[in-house]
Interface confidence: medium
């Protein structure tokens, strides 16, 4: 008899296989412990051992810890299944700058596209948006409020991070307002967070807050470990580190075993008064490139590229704090000025943000 | 009938290693975690790891930072565990358990092993 | 890693009046629409002996005045009435995530 016609559903009274009514078929009875991995197994490979929770079996027959979308700009792409991970993406409005494996290690807001430009590819989960001029010979120079506005998202074309080098790529860069990062232990072990993707897909059971054997004596790798979020200062004390929790401010550097956390101004807004480590106020201020060009583009996953205009051409809107006063430029990377000189020569891509340094040259920031 | 057969009491030094063994019996071994979990005398309950006896894979409590190692020997059907770098809050009873595939849960338990930590 | 709080401590009764145990965990221990949350009970000199699975189903060979129920993260084991058995020590466990962890326990004793 066929084998989906068995009779009288034994299964040829073959013990190792037993009849399912719903499928009309003999199927492969998987031995105990192990779990189908489909409704109707028909061999041995069919049968699978059974991981934790958040955990899948991988290609090696390992139980692997799913990567975890905690991060406030990750959305869950597909779920943890028995076999293959949770995967990751930046959430609606954003775009991964950093991938990490099933995951996203930096996000990044889609830039608006400037005034005179025209969204030519809506941003994606994976690319930023493409911009392209609006008409060829049309350059209106901020005519209207509208060409001054500071882009619905709060950012600003954004330049492209330096390279930085395989073994630290994934691990050294956090998304905009991410959770904690843990910095570069004695300057050469470098750690991942303890929710960041792992290379590995297993979550790090040493966040590198400590050495992992006990401190020989003598050692001059032993240090005095302070709490999560203090800092061992100069004096050698046990310093909080300053919190960037309020919502005009992100981290630009991350509290380590030896330094504070820094915050700055997020993306479209510029710091009014300074703080240690931080800006006690941050103002807001409008996008003017209103004269870009495209440049074209080599890298295909890369977003678009902007020259800035011509000399002279540069729209007069900056912004003046409620006070009135000119904003202070506290920082090196805060300045308002921006020389047309440096900024003409200068293509800013726009997939990290701008700095802008003293001398009024954009630098480009890894973050 | 599944049985998991503990080794018996054992006593330690400070800063030494214990290494209890679990012998399986009734059931495919290969094909089931097993679960090693402690209590302190008149204490709670402490999840330690599990091992996966077809294939050697492991998940750790992380408190234990690196000092159990869990191990299995298919061919006799025995779980090992050892904890190294003993201290007297180690003293407690060690229970090895089989963890039911599906819902997660330690159906079989052996019958425990005594270790006392002193100098 | 997840806590579980089991309350009371101690529940003084006598044999046929009701017991109920809370266990509260600190996150919520849903999974693809179960509660991984286990119930054991365990007697002096002996291993705990698994009880409930999945928030709510009694184990083969426990007797029906065993129940459990509760989702997300508050989770009871009712004992309908007690039998001079019963009287023992219950732990709550999950395995929502690893590290697994178990509750306190509370001791059932006779009042």
């Known amino acids: 008899f066929p084998q989906d016609r068995p009779f009288e559903d034994t299964c040829h009274g073959n013990p190792s296989h037993y009849y399912d009514k719903a499928v009309r078929r003999c199927c492969y009875r998987c031995p105990m412990g192990l779990f189908p991995t489909q409704q109707c197994p028909q061999r041995p490979t069919d049968c699978r051992k059974q991981c934790e929770p958040d955990y899948y079996l991988d290609e090696a027959d390992r139980c692997t810890a799913c990567v975890t979308c905690s991060r406030d700009d990750l959305v869950e792409k597909t779920p943890c299944a028995w076999n293959s991970s949770r995967v990751c993406e930046c959430r609606p409005g954003m775009f991964c700058s950093t991938s990490a494996v099933n995951s996203c290690a930096r996000c990044f807001f889609h830039s608006v596209c400037p005034a005179g430009m025209i969204v030519k590819f809506p941003g994606t989960a994976q690319k930023n948006t493409v911009c392209e001029p609006a008409s060829p010979g049309v350059s209106p120079a901020c005519a209207s409020p509208e060409n001054c506005k500071e882009p619905s998202s709060g950012t600003i074309p954004q330049a492209k991070p330096t390279p930085v080098s395989p073994a630290t790529s994934s691990a050294s860069t956090m998304p905009v307002r991410g959770g904690t990062r843990l910095a570069q232990e004695a300057a050469s072990k470098l750690t991942r967070a303890p929710d960041s993707p792992s290379s590995v897909g297993r979550p790090s059971s040493d966040p590198g807050l400590s050495p992992t054997q006990p401190c020989p004596e003598g050692s001059g790798d032993c240090r005095k470990q302070c709490e999560p979020d203090y800092y061992l200062d100069e004096a050698g004390r046990c310093t909080a580190c300053v919190s960037c929790s309020r919502d005009d401010l992100v981290e630009k550097t991350p509290c380590a075993w030896n330094s504070s956390r820094t915050c700055e101004c997020r993306p479209g807004m510029i710091c009014a008064t300074s703080a240690t480590n931080s800006c006690a106020r941050c103002v807001p201020y409008p996008i003017c490139a209103a004269e870009t060009v495209t440049k074209p583009q080599d890298m295909a996953e890369k977003d678009t590229t902007f020259e800035a205009p011509p000399l002279g051409t540069q729209p007069d809107c900056n912004p003046t704090p409620e006070n009135g006063e000119a904003p202070a430029s506290t920082s090196p990377t805060q300045s308002l000025l921006v020389d047309s000189q440096a900024s003409k020569t200068l293509p800013i891509p726009t997939s990290a943000p701008v700095a802008l340094s003293s001398t009024g040259k954009p630098v480009l920031d890894a973050g | 009938e599944v049985q998991l057969v503990q080794s018996g009491a054992e006593v330690k030094k400070p800063g030494s290693s214990v290494k209890v063994s679990c012998k399986a019996s009734?059931?495919?071994?290969?094909?089931?975690?097993m679960n090693w979990v402690r209590q302190a005398p008149g204490q709670g309950l402490e999840w330690m790891g599990q091992?996966?006896?077809?294939?050697?894979?492991?998940n750790y409590n992380g408190k234990f930072q690196g000092r159990v190692t869990l191990t299995a020997d298919k061919s006799t059907s025995t779980a090992y565990m050892e904890l190294s770098s003993l201290r007297s809050e180690d003293t407690a009873v060690y229970f090895c358990?089989?963890?039911?595939?599906?819902?997660?849960?330690?159906?079989?338990w052996g019958q425990g092993t005594l270790v006392t930590v002193s100098s | 890693e997840i806590v579980l709080t089991q309350s009371p401590a101690t529940l003084s009764l006598s044999p046929g009046e009701r017991a109920t145990l809370s266990c509260r965990a600190s996150?919520?221990?849903?999974?693809?629409?179960?509660?991984?949350m286990l119930w054991y009970q365990q007697k002096p000199g002996q291993p705990p002996k698994l009880l409930i699975y999945s928030a709510s189903n009694v184990e083969t060979g426990i007797p029906a005045r065993f129940s459990g129920s509760g989702s997300g993260t508050d989770f009871t084991l009712t004992i309908s009435s007690l039998e001079p058995e019963d009287f023992a020590v219950y732990f709550c466990?999950?395995?929502?995530?690893?590290?697994?962890?178990f509750g306190g326990g509370t001791k059932v004793e006779i009042k």
């Open positions: 358990a089989r963890r039911i595939n599906g819902n997660f849960a330690m159906d079989y």
């Open positions: 009734g059931y495919a071994f290969s094909s089931y975690w």
């Open positions: 091992i996966y006896p077809g294939d050697g894979d492991t």
């Open positions: 996150e919520s221990l849903e999974y693809y629409g179960t509660s991984l």
């Open positions: 466990q999950q395995r929502r995530k690893v590290p697994s962890t």
